[in-house]
């Protein structure tokens, strides 16, 4: 599985968005986990809701928040208030009882923000910027997904 | 259209191992699709035991997930069923199905295998 | 698991009568329900998927509606070719059946 890397600002918010094939994964829970070191187990930051059904429902921990979009095969989580050691390597998952299938393997990198360092006054900063998609930023090859739309017969 | 055919012996002996196969034709068993079996034991109603994804995920029924064992043979184009230490409750029809959830559920069906479990 | 409580487990109607069958479920699955028909010594056959669409194939007579937990299948007008026996499932987890409804024409 390929590594995607995303960055985003310090301060800022950086949006992850990990898709899946969602007949496969039909029924089955998400979690964001955070892996300690190169071969460490990967620690849970956060899951979507218990019931399934409600997994569309935010849910946080701390400053991070999960919801997955069941049907479009789609979870998406949000690193609010980034900050430099949010920095790492981190997976998507799928969880089946106590099984976990990697989704996606995510390398977030924070940048620090030129404002700590410089006049704001020689700076613009657009009003949009104060969140970052993971899918405006250049990352490694795309994973190898299923397609989540329906089936061929 | 994709078209599904269950073949194995009818009739298997107590504590033995039942075996089907569920040959998948018209289309690919790598199509986005879950490979399920499901039984009908006489005069009652329908059972889901498991079902399997060409990657050879799988899910079963909690009440048989002991002694169920679903296999897929990407080669062959077929699916396949193992029920081991069966006892006279697990005679029925077993059918064959592909399950597209939310996608369209169970639409395409074998036409059912006799299985007998009887010494 | 999820059980699925249809009613009535059997019914009697006359050609052209409109057939009405319940399917409860013991917890929320929102409209993750399918209706099957099945005809002595046939396989089922999908009528209904998601609740409320008709599958491919399938006379417009047949409809289903509900959410949730609490579920109803309709057959319009009664035809002689709709005897048989009817269930729901549920695949919001391990799928599961109704216990079927057998249709007999008076």
């Known amino acids: 599985l390929n590594t995607t890397v995303l960055q985003g600002m310090a301060g800022q918010s950086l949006r992850v968005s990990c898709t899946y094939d969602a007949l496969k994964h039909w029924g089955r829970r998400k979690a964001w986990c955070r892996q300690l070191g190169e071969e460490g187990p990967c620690q849970r930051v956060v899951s979507t809701h218990g019931v399934w059904l409600l997994a569309f429902l935010k849910k946080r921990n701390g400053s991070t928040v999960i919801a997955d979009d069941t049907l479009a095969g789609t979870v998406t989580i949000t690193l609010k208030n980034l900050q430099a050691g949010d920095a790492g390597l981190y997976q998507c998952q799928s969880l089946r009882g106590r099984e976990a299938e990697v989704l996606q393997k995510v390398l977030v990198e924070v940048l620090e923000d030129p404002l700590d360092d410089q006049d704001a006054g020689d700076l613009w900063v657009p009003e949009e910027s104060s969140s970052f998609e993971g899918a405006q930023v250049e990352h490694s090859t795309s994973r190898n997904q299923e397609t989540s739309f329906p089936p061929t017969s | 259209q994709v078209q599904l055919q269950e073949s194995g012996p009818g009739l298997v002996k107590p504590s033995g191992t039942l075996s089907l196969t569920c040959a998948v034709s018209?289309?690919?068993?790598?199509?986005?699709?879950?490979w399920s079996w499901v039984r009908q034991p006489p005069g009652k109603g329908l059972e889901w035991i498991g079902e399997i994804y060409h990657d050879a995920d799988t899910n079963y029924n909690p009440s048989l997930k002991s002694r169920v064992t679903i296999s897929v043979d990407k080669s062959k184009n077929q699916f396949s069923l193992k029920l081991s230490s069966v006892t006279a409750a697990d005679t029925a029809v077993y059918y064959c199905?592909?399950?597209?959830?939310?996608?369209?559920?169970?639409?395409?069906w074998g036409q059912g295998t006799t299985v007998t479990v009887s010494s | 698991d999820i059980q699925m409580t249809q009613s009535p487990s059997s019914l009697s109607a006359s050609v052209g009568d409109r057939v009405t069958i319940t399917c409860q479920a013991s917890q929320d699955i929102s409209n993750y329900l399918n209706w099957y028909q099945q005809k002595p010594g046939k396989a089922p056959k999908l009528l209904i998927y998601d609740a409320s669409n008709l599958a491919t194939g399938v006379p417009s007579r047949f409809s289903g509606s509900g959410s949730g937990t609490d579920f109803t299948f309709t057959i319009s007008s009664l035809q002689p070719e709709d005897i048989a026996t009817y269930y729901c499932?549920?695949?919001?987890?391990?799928?599961?059946f109704g216990g079927g409804t057998k249709v007999e024409i008076k």
């Open positions: 018209g289309g690919s068993i790598s199509d986005s699709a879950w």
């Open positions: 199905a592909r399950d597209t959830k939310y996608w369209g559920g169970m639409d395409v």
């Open positions: 499932q549920q695949y919001v987890e391990a799928p599961t």
